[in-house]
């Protein structure tokens, strides 16, 4: 009669992480009797996975029935398989001894791989904002998969940048890896609507990368542009002067009119209007009495914007 | 010797779309010899899949090498797996006979389930807007997903709906499936902002539900209320009076100004204001020269809201 | 025919020896253990040892060790159960049996039995 | 040593009787449990292996059940032939040991 042979058929499996993996083992022939065992790895150090004789594996079943007489299948199903079980599964077949049984065969191996999906991918932007012009970077993290291969870009609206490095880490074998990478954003005026993206492919999301996103409004300063004009006079003896605060981000600004150096009125704006760049434009009007003034005044708009040092702009009203 | 058998550890196998299949199958004897086949499904309508003799099965390769002498393992791998893939699979045995060879022993069978995932659940709304207070209808489908098995929610913002219909098609057996499912949504004033959301999950999706929105501003009307006050007089023989227009959606509105029922001025709005809500407000003035009036004047604001029939609140000016 | 033909039985004095083969035919002999299992009159079955056919390895009960020795001969197909320095309480049918278990021992195909009695 | 308990040590059934024979263990030995039939002056036979698997060629009335230290060999409508002495015998480890049988009598 033949000898008996341990068949594992699959070289390979590949399993995700959540899942049971089931691992092939048949023997060709009835005898020598004896128990068999699954193990992962080789040599001294293996790791029992199942023994037919005892023990208790509460996350192994069988396929069949082993305590039929005439079984041949020795397959098993692993249960709720974590990247931690990755590794090489061997059948083995023993036969009886004294006073322990002794290894007689074991099957090629089947080396288990596991899926393990990357987390939802954080992108955390710069701690304090910038304005137009200056480089802001942004970092993108996202953890536990496998397997260490994994493609990572950065888009800014639709466009892919380049100025970005990233590393997957460990560098050498491990359960799952974690990746971090760091891109590098010039800002511009227009970019309070914009958004950055950390995309990230990998096997297990079938072609649906992960994508995390930060807003650049955010991270970006725009600061006001100020314009002090005139109105036509409204009534005799009154003038109507306006100070056109433009194109700022974020809201928070303080507006103090000041004549001939001396604080004449302090608003916080409130009702902005949005411009179609995300940013905000907002208006102040003084009304003046020139009855009150015999020379000619000096009106200053003085606006502090997002805690910043306070911009100005000055208009010479002549009295006539 | 015992007699040959034909050992499939696996009742069955999943494996998802685009993935290879290992099929199990080993036997426990080299004779009688002949070849194996491989069949999808049985009896007379069974397809063959592999035969070891002779053939070109581009998808299939085998896991051993069948040319080896006292190879027992007859597994294969059949790659890039599609829904319509799924079935039973058999490894047959053949004994050499003439003038064919016969059938000796079947292995119990593999059942090959394929799971797809469905397609990005595409959501449409209504093609009209519809005011506050009505009820709208939004469609969610999905195709090409297996097993039939699939959830679908609704949600409008973060609450789930309830009045919604789902079906789930064909309703036989089927390669792959597809849904489609109608939610009825009550309009609310607050909409410009909300969102609906079709929620899918399904075995393929790993416990990360696919999700389609829509927004309901592309299926809102909100109508503006409108209210003419008279402002202070800011010069002798001046009137003015503000035609506020509040809380409309979407943007597109024209208002035109009539004294006595004469046009007087017709402008379209344009710098906004965008309340919290998503909803605009606008104000239009009407400087009135007393002195052209002996008689009270009847002043009108007129309003044309996104293409809808007029609305007009009349203010009546005394002239004294 | 698949089957376990003991050797015929014997009368010892007390203190002699006796040897049992056990002829195995039918199935591959180094493939299955061989136990030995004792029956005094009136008595139950008491186990006596273990041999592996395939690698000669023993395990004897307690109380016989010293005095049984169990061998196989692979070339015939035959097992051998020798009992030394006999005594009355050894008056006994000695059968052998297969060991068919693959995790545990059971015994699926037995011998028709040898009486060994031990008389002076 | 692992030391098998039977019960009760003899029955007199009637054929037709559903005949219930115990055993236990005095510690766990899994599910390795036999059983055999023993007639005067034949060897034993096996009817069960691995506490409730039917060996091949014995009739189904024979069935057996339990794991860890309590088994039962049922026998559901007893027939002539099944008049005999059973053994349990665990197999778990060495040395092996029996039960000390229970014998089966003509009420």
């Known amino acids: 009669e033949d000898e008996l042979q341990v068949i594992q058929p699959e070289k390979s499996v590949s399993v995700a992480a959540g899942e049971s993996a089931t691992l092939c083992c048949a023997m060709t022939s009835l005898i020598p009797v004896g128990p068999i065992m699954w193990f992962r790895g080789a040599g001294a150090g293996r790791e029992l996975i199942y023994n037919q004789k005892e023990g208790h594996f509460p996350r192994v079943t069988t396929v069949s029935e082993l305590t039929k007489r005439n079984n041949l299948d020795f397959s098993i199903s692993i249960s709720n398989i974590t990247p931690a079980d990755a590794g090489t599964y061997y059948c083995v077949k023993f036969r009886k001894g004294s006073p322990d049984d002794v290894e007689f065969k074991s099957g090629a191996g089947t080396e288990l791989s596991v899926r393990a999906k990357p987390s939802a991918p954080v992108v955390s932007g710069p701690a304090v904002r910038a304005t137009p012009e200056h480089t802001v970077s942004f970092t993108c993290e996202s953890h536990g998969f496998s397997p260490r291969d994994i493609t990572l870009k950065w888009f800014k609206n639709g466009n892919e940048l380049s100025d970005f490095q990233t590393n997957v880490d460990p560098a050498g074998d491990s359960v799952s890896y974690s990746i971090h990478s760091t891109a590098r954003v010039v800002l511009t005026r227009g970019d309070v609507h914009s958004q950055v993206i950390c995309e990230m492919a990998h096997i297990t999301l079938q072609g649906d990368p992960l994508r995390g996103t930060a807003n650049l409004s955010e991270a970006i300063r725009v600061p006001p542009t100020l314009e002090v004009t005139q109105q036509p006079m409204r009534a005799e003896n009154q003038a109507n002067v306006t100070c056109q605060v433009s194109n700022f981000y974020p809201r928070g600004l303080q507006l103090t009119w000041l004549e001939n150096g001396n604080v004449s009125r302090t608003e916080t704006a409130s009702t902005l209007i949005e411009n179609k760049d995300g940013t905000y434009n907002w208006m102040s009007w003084l009304l003046v009495n020139t009855c009150a003034h015999r020379d000619d005044v000096v009106l200053t708009c003085q606006v502090e914007h997002d805690g910043q040092q306070a911009v100005s702009k000055s208009y010479a009203l002549e009295i006539s | 010797e015992d007699e040959l058998q034909v050992i499939q550890p696996e009742k069955s196998v999943s494996v998802a779309a685009g993935e290879s299949a290992t099929l199990c199958c080993a036997m426990t004897s080299l004779i009688p010899v002949g070849p194996i086949m491989w069949f999808r499904g049985a009896g007379a309508g069974r397809e063959l899949i592999y035969n070891q003799k002779e053939g070109h099965f581009p998808r299939v390769t085998t896991v051993s090498e069948l040319t080896k002498r006292n190879n027992l393992d007859f597994s294969i791998s059949i790659s890039n797996i599609t829904p319509a893939d799924a079935g039973t699979y058999y490894c047959v045995k053949f004994r050499k006979g003439s003038p064919d060879d016969v059938e000796f022993k079947s292995g119990a069978g593999t059942e090959l389930s394929v799971r797809a995932k469905p397609s990005a659940p595409v959501v449409s709304g209504p093609a009209v807007r519809a005011t506050p207070e009505h009820t709208v209808s939004f469609t969610c489908e999905s195709h090409g997903f297996s097993p039939r098995d699939i959830t679908l929610k609704w949600f409008k913002n973060g609450n789930e709906l309830s009045d919604f219909q789902t079906n789930v098609d064909p309703a036989g057996d089927s390669v792959s499936y597809s849904i489609h499912s109608t939610a009825r949504v009550v309009l609310t004033r607050g909409d410009v902002h909300s969102q609906v959301i079709c929620e899918m999950a399904h075995i393929t999706l790993q416990g990360d539900p696919l999700r389609g929105t829509a927004n309901l501003s592309e299926a809102i009307r909100v109508p503006p209320t409108l209210e003419v006050t008279q402002q202070p007089m800011r010069a002798e023989n001046q009137a003015n009076v503000t035609c506020q227009v509040s809380n409309f959606y979407p943007r597109g509105l024209q208002l035109t100004w009539l004294e006595n029922g004469n046009v007087s001025r017709t402008e379209t709005a344009s710098t906004l204001i965008e309340n919290k809500d998503g909803t605009y407000n606008w104000m239009s003035w009407l400087l009135v020269n007393t002195c052209a009036h002996r008689d009270d004047v009847v002043l009108t604001c007129q309003v044309e809201h996104d293409g809808q029939q007029a609305v007009s609140k009349s203010y009546a000016l005394e002239i004294s | 025919q698949v089957q376990l033909v003991q050797s015929g039985a014997e009368v010892k004095k007390p203190g002699a020896s006796v040897k049992v083969s056990c002829k195995a035919s039918?199935?591959?002999?180094?493939?299955?253990?061989i136990v030995w299992v004792r029956q005094a009159p009136g008595q139950g079955l008491e186990w006596m040892g273990w041999?592996?056919?395939?690698?000669?390895?023993?395990n004897y009960a307690q109380k016989l060790q010293g005095r049984v020795t169990m061998t196989t001969d692979t070339s015939t197909s035959t097992a051998y159960m020798e009992l030394r320095s006999l005594r009355s309480d050894d008056t006994a049918v000695y059968y052998c049996?297969?060991?068919?278990?693959?995790?545990?021992?059971?015994?699926?195909?037995w011998g028709r039995g040898t009486l060994v009695t031990v008389s002076s | 040593d692992i030391q098998m308990t039977q019960s009760p040590s003899s029955v007199s059934a009637s054929v037709g009787d559903r005949v219930t024979i115990t055993c236990r263990a005095s510690q766990g030995i899994s599910s390795w449990l036999a059983w055999y039939q023993q007639k005067p002056g034949k060897a034993p036979k096996l009817l069960i292996y691995a506490a409730s698997n039917l060996q091949s060629g014995v009739p189904s009335r024979f069935s057996g059940s339990g794991s860890g230290t309590d088994f039962t060999l049922t026998i559901s409508s007893l027939q002539p032939e099944d008049f005999a002495t059973y053994y349990c015998?665990?197999?778990?480890?060495?040395?092996?040991?029996f039960g000390g049988g229970t014998k089966v009598e003509i009420k």
């Open positions: 049996a297969r060991e068919a278990g693959s995790s545990w021992y059971d015994f699926d195909l």
């Open positions: 039918g199935y591959t002999f180094t493939g299955y253990g």
């Open positions: 041999i592996s056919a395939y690698a000669g390895e023993t």
């Open positions: 015998q665990q197999g778990a480890s060495f040395p092996i040991t």
